[in-house]
Interface confidence: low
């Protein structure tokens, strides 16, 4: 999916109002310096591409992020504010319906969510000194 035409400001508002807090809740008890940020992004569409990948694509050692509250809200924000996004995610939706409570948070998942926090911060990079 090409995130170029998303309403970035609306997604930013969704992140600041709720998704960021859910990410913090997930990471509770973890030191902010525990993980190094190895994933980055270079513009807002790129950030959303990386955020989608880390949030919804299962990885070795961390298969369950898509069921987390921050992931559900991320999916909702993308579906609302990115034209045509929901149509590309029909297969993913089937898996989302089987939402279960998270049992064990693996270290790999914590590291992945730490990367997500960094990507979201990059996405929300302020308009520093722009004239």
């Amino acid at each position: 999916y090409d995130f170029t035409n998303c309403d970035f400001e609306k997604i930013k508002a969704a992140y600041l109002s709720t998704i960021s807090k859910d990410l913090i809740t997930y990471m509770s008890g973890t030191k902010s310096t525990e993980f190094n940020n190895t994933v980055s992004c270079s513009n807002r569409p790129h950030c959303l591409t990386e955020i989608q990948s880390l949030t919804f694509n299962p990885t070795a050692g961390c298969a369950s992020l898509a069921k987390e509250m921050f992931a559900m809200k991320t999916k909702a924000a993308l579906a609302i504010w990115c034209p045509g996004y929901s149509e590309t995610q029909i297969n993913a939706t089937q898996a989302m319906k089987k939402r279960r409570k998270r049992k064990v948070t693996t270290n790999k998942c914590l590291e992945q969510v730490s990367q997500l926090q960094g990507l979201w911060r990059r996405f929300n990079r302020p308009l520093l000194k722009q004239q």
């Epitope: 170029t4 992004c41 270079s42 513009n43 807002r44 569409p45 790129h46 990079r125 308009l127 520093l128 000194k129 722009q130 004239q131």
Partner: antibody
Amino acid sequence: QMQLVESGGGVVQPGRSLRLSCAASGFAFRTYGMHWVRQAPGKGLEWVAVIWYDGSNTHYADSVKGRFTITRDNSKNTLNLQMNSLRAEDTAVYYCVRAPQWYLSAEAFDLWGQGTMVTVSS
Amino acid sequence: SYVLTQPPSVSVAPGQTARITCGGNLIGSKLVHWYQQKPGQAPVLVVYDDSDRPSRIPERFSGSNSGNTATLTISRVEAGDEADYYCQVWDYSSNHVVFGGGTKLTVL
């Protein structure tokens, strides 16, 4: 690893043309703004041109405007600089440079190629 | 067009602190980046967005920017820090990247 490799430099007579290329590897080329920066022998750095990550905008230094054209092919991860009507003062090492592309272009150049030498002489 | 002014040279003894300035009209309203260039090599980013540092750059390198002057500070200078240093900004009014003329840092 992340890399930018320039090619196409050489010796050319004044008034002639030259085309520089830059091959990018190890990173998502299509998401970065790309620039050319040059450095005349014994002199400082001089910015030449920028092209937006998606090719939608280009800007040029006044000294090359109308003579140089910056283009990119995101499917091949390549950046090009077409240099026409070359002058002796265009003699320099030309660097291909990467910069994250945010709202405008106030970003730092975080990856540089090793440069290719262009000599304009009769 | 926007102009950045740097001193041509700065000298410092090993272990001391070097300060390289970059002057420009209301430069404090712009984001300033700093590059180090050693002979025969491509430039390397050492400070970006006024004061941030890439992960591979030692903490000895720091930056500040306000008013009409941006400053690159190198504390506990080492012989390996000897190089040319350039400041850079984006000039919104002209849509141009602007470099300072460069400062040669000599470690005595």
